[in-house]
Amino acid sequence: APVLPGEDSKDVAAPHSQPLTSSERIDKHIRYILDGISALRKETCNRSNMCESSKEALAENNLNLPKMAEKDGCFQSGFNEDTCLVKIITGLLEFEVYLEYLQNRFESSEEQARAVQMSTKVLIQFLQKKAKNLDAITTPEPTTNASLLTKLQAQNQWLQDMTTHLILRSFKEFLQSSLRALRQM
């Protein structure tokens, strides 16, 4: 199974001799997840033409995927550490149902999909330790998640491929925005 960052001293993303700080661990963890997404996107792009689809086609798929906006305080303009951290954690919690959906969507990268899901859970725990304002973090309702999952799995093949592509692309974007923001904290 894929090794989580920090479990293997040979991990190239951590060339430090001294123990990693909390911020470095989080940074390394996000980069590990992004590497996993990269592998999943490669499989998705190889088996369908979704990666070259226009934004208009993507917009037809009415997924309510978490997205960073100016008001979330994670961009350079209007940067706000507390607001941003809440948005990152809330967004990751919202992505969990979509990561669950991805679990049966890959053949050669099945383990990678599981690693991305498990690593995201660990990342949420890291970030919750860092957050002061945990009260502001809303966790999605399990029943809502269950019905969403059922709905996504009932789509036709083309829509499922599109959904997979869109989840991966959006999760990549969200993590990269998070990474940039966390580096300012």
């Epitope: 470095e24 997404i37 070259e52 990549k172 990269q176 940039r180 580096r183």
Partner: antibody, heavy 123, light 107 residues
Framework: QVQLVESGGGLVQPGGSLRLSCAAS????????MTWVRQAPGKGLEWVSS????????AYADSVKGRFTISRDNAKNTLYLQMNSLKSEDTAVYYC????????????????WGQGTQVTVSS | DIQMTQSPSSLPTSLGDSVTITCQAS??????LSWYQQKPGQTPKLLIY???KLQTGVPSRFSGSGSGTSFTLTISGLEAEDLATYYC?????????FGQGTKVELK
């Protein structure tokens, strides 16, 4: 092949405005971060501004913050830099650059550069 | 803001020599450092990204090392076409910052 072609440079008076454009071709533009870098005559490189793929997230150098605005039109494969309240120290060649890799980018690095467009701010 | 200190600013050398340029960050930038080569009248060219990864098409005599705050670009066996100005760039956090540049020239 990948091509980045800048336009819109020229001579402008202090306090004036210019809009630079960068036409991109040979790659899926919407998948890539794009950046403007400038170089004053006889000086080194200076990072100016970056815009990310779909998030609308932008970043600026302190020297241009509040005066310059970066934007992109993914449908037209074009990157823009709106420059207002121009100062003499903004005189430089402005390069449009593409960030490494479209599928995953945690590492910054500019793998393709346009030929640059000259901006001269003088009275 | 993270400051980048590149040294030396000028490096008189001879063809065939091994050349080392260093870049120091004012705080840790992990491995988010890239190196560029610029010849007079030309656009910059990416040599190294991620501190040590060689960009496609770049000769293997170029290598990068380091992480955290200290980074090095090495040219093993300088060739005439390598005479240029070299810049490092921190891409860890905004505002991103280039080093001041190192001009590699003949003695």
């Amino acid at each position: 092949q990948v091509q980045l072609v800048e336009s819109g440079g020229g001579l402008v008076q202090p306090g004036g405005s210019l809009r630079l454009s960068c036409a991109a071709s040979g790659f899926t533009f919407s998948n890539y971060y794009m950046t403007w870098v400038r170089q004053a005559p006889g000086k080194g490189l200076e990072w100016v501004s970056s815009i990310y793929s779909f998030s609308g997230d932008t970043a600026y150098a302190d020297s241009v913050k509040g005066r310059f605005t970066i934007s992109r039109d993914n449908a037209k494969n074009t990157l823009y830099l709106q420059m207002n309240s121009l100062k003499s120290e903004d005189t430089a060649v402005y390069y449009c650059t593409r960030n490494l890799g479209g599928v995953v980018v945690t590492t910054n690095g500019y793998d393709y550069w346009g030929q640059g467009t000259q901006v001269t701010v003088s009275s | 803001d993270i400051q980048m200190t590149q040294s030396p600013s000028s490096l008189p050398t001879s063809l065939g020599d091994s050349v080392t340029i260093t870049c120091q960050a004012s705080q840790s930038i992990s491995d988010e450092l890239s190196w560029y080569q610029q010849k007079p009248g030309q656009t910059p060219k990416l040599l190294i990204y991620g501190a040590s990864k060689l960009q496609t098409g770049v000769p293997s005599r170029f290598s990068g090392s380091g992480s955290g705050t200290s980074f090095t670009l090495t040219i093993s066996g300088l060739e005439a076409e390598d005479l240029a100005t070299y810049y490092c760039l921190q891409g860890y956090s905004w505002p991103f910052m280039f080093g001041q540049g190192t001009k590699v020239e003949l003695k």
